[in-house]
Interface confidence: low
């Protein structure tokens, strides 16, 4: 289709090479068409279409995204050619940063309901640049935490080094919806609830003598409880002896509960003690079996192909640790009689 009639928007993504971050493009189709797409004949020349991202209508979730190759080749369907770009309703998610994401992205409705819809499309020219050392060194993270029940704030990473007075007007979106009252480089939250969690996007306009463009940053916000003050506790095994049959296979499970920590590096491992020797055992990877806001239960098994006499002389020890401390639980195998 002819993209010459598409409305055009220029965006800049400046990414930090030190952290993982995502980026999004919204299919900014004009406001009056959010249910019927772009029947441009409904607008008089004096009416300026208000560009907004995804409006939540069922229709608008059905859009098609393309990338325009720089060499003039035909448009490419995003879903077929770019595995690191995911389409969610009318939003395009870039999972990994990199200058190779630079280019022109076009969105338009999948369903063309009238001849006027043919020209209904938005072309976004995205420029992606790594943050230079000259940029602010202590810019806000693209992953920010809000402590439940307390006050907090969400900062726009690309503007966090500027004072509120210097800051340009910022447009904020949460999960693709416009937050019309927020205009500064920081959203202040008086009391944090779990619904404050989500994907926030902050946009502001930058201009030079030639053109203007939108600088965009994406912030993943999670609501968290305070870090635990407790070391992990072992839920299983409870008993320190276990009756077993010689020659039979055996699996011993270690389940431990870890309290929430913002920087979470749980350790759960098995080791064997035998007389004056002690060594860690290669066992299957640990797996999380339950995760809540406050804690996580992690399980790791030790598997014996068959129980031998030698195993009865040993202690099998489950060791768990977080930043507060560690806990152990040892199990001695005992031959089942009769």
């Amino acid at each position: 289709f002819n993209i010459s009639g598409c409305s055009t928007k220029k965006l800049l993504w400046t990414y930090s090479t030190r952290s993982e971050e995502e980026f999004v493009l919204f299919c900014d189709l004009p406001e009056p068409q959010k249910s019927h797409f772009c029947h441009r004949n409904r607008l008089s020349p004096k009416q300026v279409p208000e560009h907004l991202p995804f409006m939540g209508s069922n229709d608008l979730s059905d859009v098609q995204w393309y990338q325009q190759p720089s060499n003039g080749d035909p448009l490419e369907d995003i879903r077929k050619s770019y595995p690191h770009i995911i389409q969610d309703k009318c939003t395009l998610h870039f999972l990994t940063p990199g200058v190779n994401n630079s280019g022109s992205y076009i969105c338009r409705p999948k369903m063309i309901k009238s001849p006027y819809d043919v020209a209904c499309c938005v072309k976004m020219i995205l420029e992606v640049k790594p943050q230079t050392n000259a940029s602010c060194e202590y810019s806000a993270s693209h992953k920010q935490d809000l402590l439940l029940g307390s006050t907090g704030s969400i900062s726009c990473p690309s503007l966090s080094c500027q004072s509120d007075a210097q800051s340009p007007a910022v447009t904020w979106y949460k999960n693709g919806k416009l937050l019309s009252v927020e205009r500064s480089n920081r959203i202040v939250v008086d009391e944090v609830y779990d619904y404050h969690q989500g994907t926030y996007v902050c946009d502001y306009t930058q201009s030079d003598t030639v053109s203007s463009w939108t600088v965009r940053a994406v912030v993943q916000v999670r609501t968290i409880v305070g870090d635990t003050k407790l070391k992990p506790d072992i839920l299983d095994p409870v008993e320190d002896t276990l009756e077993v049959e010689l020659g039979k296979p055996l699996t011993i499970s270690c389940k431990a509960r870890f309290g929430f920590e913002r920087v979470f590096n749980p350790v759960i491992k098995w080791y064997i003690k035998d007389s004056d020797l002690e060594w860690e055992v290669s066992v299957p990877e640990a797996k999380s079996i339950k995760s809540t806001l406050k804690d996580e239960i992690i399980e790791r098994n030790i598997i014996l192909e068959k129980v031998t006499q030698r195993d009865l002389r040993r202690k099998f020890v489950c060791f768990v640790q977080n930043s507060i401390g560690n806990t152990t639980q040892s199990v001695q195998l005992k031959e089942k009689r009769g």
């Epitope: 020659g247 064997i272 007389s275 004056d276 060594w279 014996l304 192909e305 031998t308 030698r310 195993d311």
Partner: antibody
Framework: SLEESGGDLVKPGASLTLTCTAS?????????VCWVRQAPGKGLEWIAC???????TDYARWAKGRFTISKTSSTTVTLQMTGLTAADTATYFC??????????????WGPGTLVTVSS | DIVMTQTPASVEAAVGGTVTIKCQAS??????LAWYQQKPGQPPKLLIY???TLASGVPSRFKGSGSGTEFTLTISDLECADAATYYC????????????????FGGGTEVVVK
């Protein structure tokens, strides 16, 4: 004493079973029986051990899957070898360790049997 | 698996002299270490087990020491009959679950007696 048998000249890819036979004692729960090999002009290389009491086995990582140690009677232990290559050419020794002491330190060794893998 | 590193590869000493051979384990093996002597055309002979215990019939000129990862075999008052290759062996009786490496040998040290 211990004596190994079954060494032979075989082609690459072949299988071979070596036997270790005890004389003057039997392989009871008191002993570990181990196989060790030595390529011509090279050092000793541990292959595997078996607890003669409960039959539990222990292999060098490189030997797992291709070599199988078994106790076949109260006086014999075998080493089955599959997928032989020229790198398996060596003298194969069987040795006896002390299970009560719970180590593989071997106080009794056989004279060895030569396995040659060549096309 | 445990890796045993033995040094030196070769050592020369005079009759009546002393030779020291070192063996290093890639992880702690407590005192589960044996030393063997091997002469050409013969199977190895056990000298020392549990790092420092002399095997039956072995003269006290052979002395083993160390624990954990560092071990030493010292042969004093060298005799011509001591010319041989010496091997250390990690020999904890492990099982399939332990991944402890069983009976790995060091690369050997040739002792030449002048």
């Amino acid at each position: 004493s211990l004596e190994e048998s079954g060494g032979d000249l075989v082609k690459p890819g072949a299988s071979l079973t070596l036997t270790c036979t005890a004389s003057g004692f039997s392989f009871s729960s008191r002993y570990y029986v181990c196989w060790v090999r030595q390529a011509p002009g090279k050092g000793l290389e541990w292959i595997a051990c078996i607890d003669a009491g409960d039959g539990s086995t222990d292999y060098a990582r490189w030997a797992k899957g291709r070599f199988t140690i078994s106790k076949t009677s109260s006086t014999t232990v075998t080493l089955q070898m599959t997928g032989l290559t020229a790198a398996d050419t060596a003298t194969y020794f069987c040795a006896r360790g002390d299970a009560y002491r719970d180590d593989y330190a071997s106080d009794l060794w056989g004279p060895g049997t030569l396995v040659t893998v060549s096309s | 698996d445990i890796v045993m590193t033995q040094t030196p590869a070769s050592v020369e000493a005079a009759v009546g002299g002393t030779v020291t051979i070192k063996c290093q384990a890639s992880q702690s093996i407590s005192s589960y270490l044996a030393w063997y002597q091997q002469k050409p055309g013969q199977p190895p002979k056990l000298l020392i087990y549990r790092a420092s215990t002399l095997a039956s019939g072995v003269p006290s000129r052979f002395k083993g020491s160390g624990s954990g990862t560092e071990f030493t075999l010292t042969i004093s008052d060298l005799e011509c009959a001591d010319a041989a290759t010496y091997y250390c062996q990690s020999n904890y009786g492990s099982s399939s679950i332990s991944n402890y490496g069983g009976g790995a040998f060091g690369g050997g040290t040739e002792v030449v007696v002048k």
